[in-house]
């Protein structure tokens, strides 16, 4: 009786189980009662990343330099090319099909995580006791100056965008 299901790494064709082609190879001809499945390696700039019965390999992804993309990892016969973005830019999606500028953190916000080729700058609001007076893609929130350690007193309170202003202590006459 012909099989209705096949083992892993096999496929059912013409009422028989044929071996799938291994990653990096494509199907040339199905097996028969007398012959094994015939597979051929993918060509240059092509790949297949699974056990398969594909008759055509997939083209490696093109990292278009006009979009700010460059090759992070060259593709093989079994893996696709991985693109990333040029310095100062990051991917707009996991597939990395285009790039956008890194964001700067506005005054009152500090950098929690510096941007990479695949992720944007992550900003966080400066908590009480900290400030940022610049727009930056790498500066964290800075702590307010401690007037006490300088033998001074606070003359003007700090905010999330400004440092405290220290001044001399009033001397009793």
């Amino acid at each position: 009786e012909p099989p209705t299901a096949c083992r892993e790494k096999q496929y059912l064709i013409n009422s028989q189980c044929c071996s799938l082609c291994q990653p990096g190879q494509k199907l040339v001809s199905d097996c028969t009662e007398f012959t094994e499945t015939e597979c051929l390696p993918c060509g240059e700039s092509e790949f297949l990343d699974t056990w398969n019965r594909e008759t055509h390999c997939h083209q490696h992804k093109y990292c278009d330099p006009n979009l700010g993309l460059r090759v992070q990892q060259k593709g093989t016969s079994e893996t696709d090319t991985i693109c990333t973005c040029e310095e100062g830019w990051h991917c707009t999606s996991e597939a990395c099909e285009s790039c956008v500028l890194h964001r700067s953190c506005s005054p009152g916000f500090g950098v929690k995580q510096i941007a990479t080729g695949v992720s944007d700058t992550i900003c966080e609001p400066c908590p009480v006791g900290f400030f940022s007076n610049v727009s930056s893609a790498f500066e964290k929130c800075h702590p307010w100056t401690s007037c006490e350690t300088k033998d001074l007193v606070v003359q003007q309170a700090g905010t999330n965008k400004t440092d405290v202003v220290c001044g001399p202590q009033d001397r009793l006459r």
Epitope: P65, N66, L67, G68, C85, E86, E87, G88, W89, T92, E97, S98, C99, V100, L101, H102, R103, S104, I114, T121, S135, S136, A137, F138, E139
Partner: antibody, heavy 112, light 112 residues
């Protein structure tokens, strides 16, 4: 694929002017576009860039003198308060770290 | 800001000859260097990007080399059509959210 600038004309100092770059054959939701200018007989000078998401970056000398914005098919450059020093041919150019596609340019003359 | 020093300002060579143009960056820009050709009344045309990659449709007579701060454009088997002004352009990201696209002063190539 092409880009073309328009809006250049003779203006008096202090009169705001908006130049438009119209693109065809590609999408501004994928590509970044810069504005570059060239004073008569001089070299090229980068002004600023707008990315596919609408984020902008400007040359350090710009200091609010120019603003770049975009719609789905155009990129605008606003010269906020032109001076005679802003007399130049203004080009829009597509690219991220280099510029592979340029428009023919539009001439802005600032004179009293 | 990055400063690009391009030399020479002008060079003359015979048809079939070779011309070498140099560009020096004030700080390291890795391989973020492009070369453009500009003829009078026309926009710049990209020749080389990433220091040595030839742009689409550009003859292999144009060769770019260098990295870091020193870059060279070599034009061999010079043709009359190569008479133009050539510009280098650097891209630099400071890491502080500041972007810089700086052009060299240009080199006029005269073909005899």
């Amino acid at each position: 694929q092409s880009v073309e600038e328009s809006g250049g004309r003779l203006i008096t100092p202090g009169t705001p002017l908006t130049l438009t770059c119209t693109v065809s054959g590609f999408s501004l939701s994928t590509y970044a576009v810069s504005w570059v200018r060239q004073a008569p007989g001089k070299g090229l000078e980068w002004i600023g860039i707008i990315d596919s998401g609408g984020g902008t970056a400007y040359a350090s000398w710009v200091k609010g003198r120019f603003t770049i914005s975009k719609t789905s098919t155009t990129v605008d450059l606003k010269i906020t308060s032109p001076t005679t020093e802003d007399t130049a041919t203004y080009f829009c150019a597509r690219g991220v770290t280099f510029f592979g596609l340029w428009g023919p340019g539009t001439l802005v003359t600032v004179s009293s | 800001d990055i400063v690009m020093t391009q030399t020479p300002a002008s060079v003359e060579a015979a048809v079939g000859g070779t011309v070498t143009i140099k560009c020096q960056a004030s700080q390291s820009i890795s391989n973020y260097l492009s070369w453009y050709q500009q003829k009078p009344g026309q926009p710049p045309k990209l020749l080389i990007y990433r220091a040595s990659d030839l742009a689409s449709g550009v003859p292999s007579r144009f060769k770019g080399s260098g990295s870091g701060t020193e870059f060279t454009l070599t034009i061999s088997d010079l043709e009359c059509a190569d008479a133009a002004t050539y510009y280098c352009q650097a891209y630099y990201y400071s890491g502080g959210g500041s972007y810089d696209y700086a052009f060299g002063g240009g080199t006029e190539v005269v073909v005899k």
